[in-house]
C-alpha cells in the first residue's frame, strides 16, 4: 500500500499526525463513521501536549473524541490502552449519569468547554475531531 506523507487539504498537521476539526455536530457513532470514511479515526489523545493542541483548535465547545465504554470497559477506537494511557477527566467523571432522562447512561467521551473530559449520551450532536497518522501504510484490503 501507499504511505501518506502529507496531510489532506483542510487537515492540520501536528507531530506526524493529521487532524480535522468539524464545525457541525453529529452523534458519536456518526462522527465515528465520518472519520473512518476519511481513512481516519476519532481523535485519540495520548499526551498532555496533544491535549493542549486539540484544545487550542476546538475552543470552549463540547467535542467528541475516540473514547467510549459502550461495550463495558473504556476503549480508545484505535486500540490504544486506556488503563495505562493519558487521561484528563473532569473531577468526578466519568460518572455514567442516568439522570438526563434520555434512557441509559453515558458511554461516550467528549472535551468540555475547559478541555477536560466528560462522559455523555452518545446521541448528543457534538462537534468532533478526526485524526490519522502520517507515514502509515494505507489499509487497502488485498484484492480477491
Amino acid at each position: 500500500g501507499s504511505e501518506r506523507t502529507c496531510c489532506p487539504v483542510n487537515w492540520v498537521e501536528h507531530e506526524r499526525s493529521c487532524y480535522w476539526f468539524s464545525r457541525s455536530g453529529k452523534a458519536w457513532a456518526d462522527a465515528d463513521n465520518y472519520c473512518r470514511l476519511e481513512d481516519a479515526h476519532l481523535v485519540v489523545v495520548t499526551s498532555w501536549e496533544e491535549q493542549k493542541f486539540v484544545q487550542h483548535h476546538i475552543g470552549p465547545v463540547n467535542t467528541w473524541m475516540g473514547l467510549h465504554d459502550q461495550n463495558g470497559p473504556w476503549k480508545w477506537v484505535d486500540g490504544t490502552d486506556y488503563e495505562t494511557g493519558f487521561k484528563n477527566w473532569r473531577p468526578e467523571q466519568p460518572d455514567d449519569w442516568y439522570g438526563h432522562g434520555l434512557g441509559g447512561g453515558e458511554d461516550c467521551a467528549h472535551f468540555t468547554d475547559d478541555g477536560r473530559w466528560n462522559d455523555d449520551v452518545c446521541q448528543r450532536p457534538y462537534r468532533w475531531v478526526c485524526e490519522t497518522e502520517l507515514d502509515k501504510a494505507s489499509q487497502e484490503p488485498p484484492l480477491l
Epitope: N33, Y34, E38, D39, S138, E140, P141
Partner: antibody, heavy 121, light 106 residues
C-alpha cells in the same frame, strides 16, 4: 470527463460467484469514497456497499454482509465487487458510484452505466 | 433498521410546482440527497446536503429538510422532468434510499 465504466456482469447459477469491476477516470480516484448500488428489475435503488478513499473502511448492507466484498486498487483507479453465494434475489443492475464528499454528509454525484447480473439456474 | 418513506407517485401539470416528500425518524438531523432516474438511465444527483445543487442542475430544483421530512421541490415543471426520484440519507453505518416516487407530467 469524469467517468465510471463497469464490466464483468453476466449470468451465474445460484450459489455461484462473480467478480466485476468499475474503471474510474477524470478525477482523483483515491480521494473519494465509492459505492455499489443495485436495482432489481422494476424496483427501486438499493445500496450494497461503500469503501473509503484509501480503502481502510468498508460498510455493507445487511442483505449482502458476509457474501459480498468491496475493494479498490487506487494504483489502477479501479473499484471491485466480489459476490459469493449468489441468490436469485441478487439479480439486478449493479451501478458503481462516486461520492461527492464524505458519505455521511454528501450524495453520489457520478454513476456508471450499470452492469447486469442475473442469478438463475 | 432505518426507513425512508416516499409517496409512490406524484402528478403535476406543466409549469406547475411539484413537491416530493421523504419521511424518516429525525431525518432533519441527517443530510438528505435526491436522485433523478429516467427509464433505462443511471441515476443523477440533483440535490445533496438537503438543499445544494450540483453544477448543471437547474435552479428549478430545490430541497429542504427539517423535523422528520425532507422535500424536493421542482418549479416550472417540464415534460423532461418526468422520472423516478429517490431520497437518500446515511444512518447507523448504512446508506438508506427511499422507495422512490414516480413523477408524472400531465
Amino acid at each position: 470527463e469524469v467517468q465510471l465504466l463497469e464490466s464483468g456482469g453476466g449470468l451465474v447459477q445460484p450459489g455461484g460467484s462473480l467478480r466485476f469491476s468499475c474503471a474510474a477516470s477524470g478525477f482523483t480516484f483515491s480521494s473519494h469514497a465509492m459505492s455499489w448500488v443495485r436495482q432489481a428489475p422494476g424496483k427501486g435503488l438499493e445500496w450494497v456497499s461503500v469503501i473509503s478513499g484509501g480503502g481502510s473502511s468498508t460498510y455493507y448492507a445487511d442483505s449482502v454482509k458476509g457474501r459480498f466484498t468491496i475493494s479498490r486498487d487506487n494504483s489502477k483507479n479501479t473499484l471491485y465487487l466480489q459476490m459469493n453465494s449468489l441468490r436469485a434475489e441478487d439479480t439486478a443492475v449493479y451501478y458503481c458510484a462516486k461520492w461527492r464528499g464524505n458519505p455521511t454528509d454528501y450524495g453520489m454525484d457520478v454513476w456508471g452505466q450499470g452492469t447486469t447480473v442475473t442469478v438463475s439456474s | 433498521s432505518y426507513e425512508l418513506t416516499q409517496p409512490p407517485s406524484v402528478s403535476v401539470s406543466p409549469g406547475q410546482t411539484a413537491s416530493i416528500t421523504c419521511s424518516g425518524d429525525k431525518l432533519g438531523d441527517k443530510y438528505a440527497s435526491w436522485y433523478q432516474q429516467k427509464p433505462g438511465q443511471s441515476p443523477v444527483l440533483v440535490i445533496y446536503q438537503d438543499n445544494k445543487r450540483p453544477s448543471g442542475i437547474p435552479e428549478r430544483f430545490s430541497g429542504s429538510n427539517s423535523g422528520n421530512t425532507a422535500t424536493l421541490t421542482i418549479g416550472g415543471i417540464q415534460a423532461m422532468d418526468e422520472a423516478d426520484y429517490y431520497c437518500q440519507a446515511w444512518d447507523s453505518s448504512t446508506v438508506v434510499f427511499g422507495g422512490g416516487t414516480k413523477l408524472t407530467v400531465l
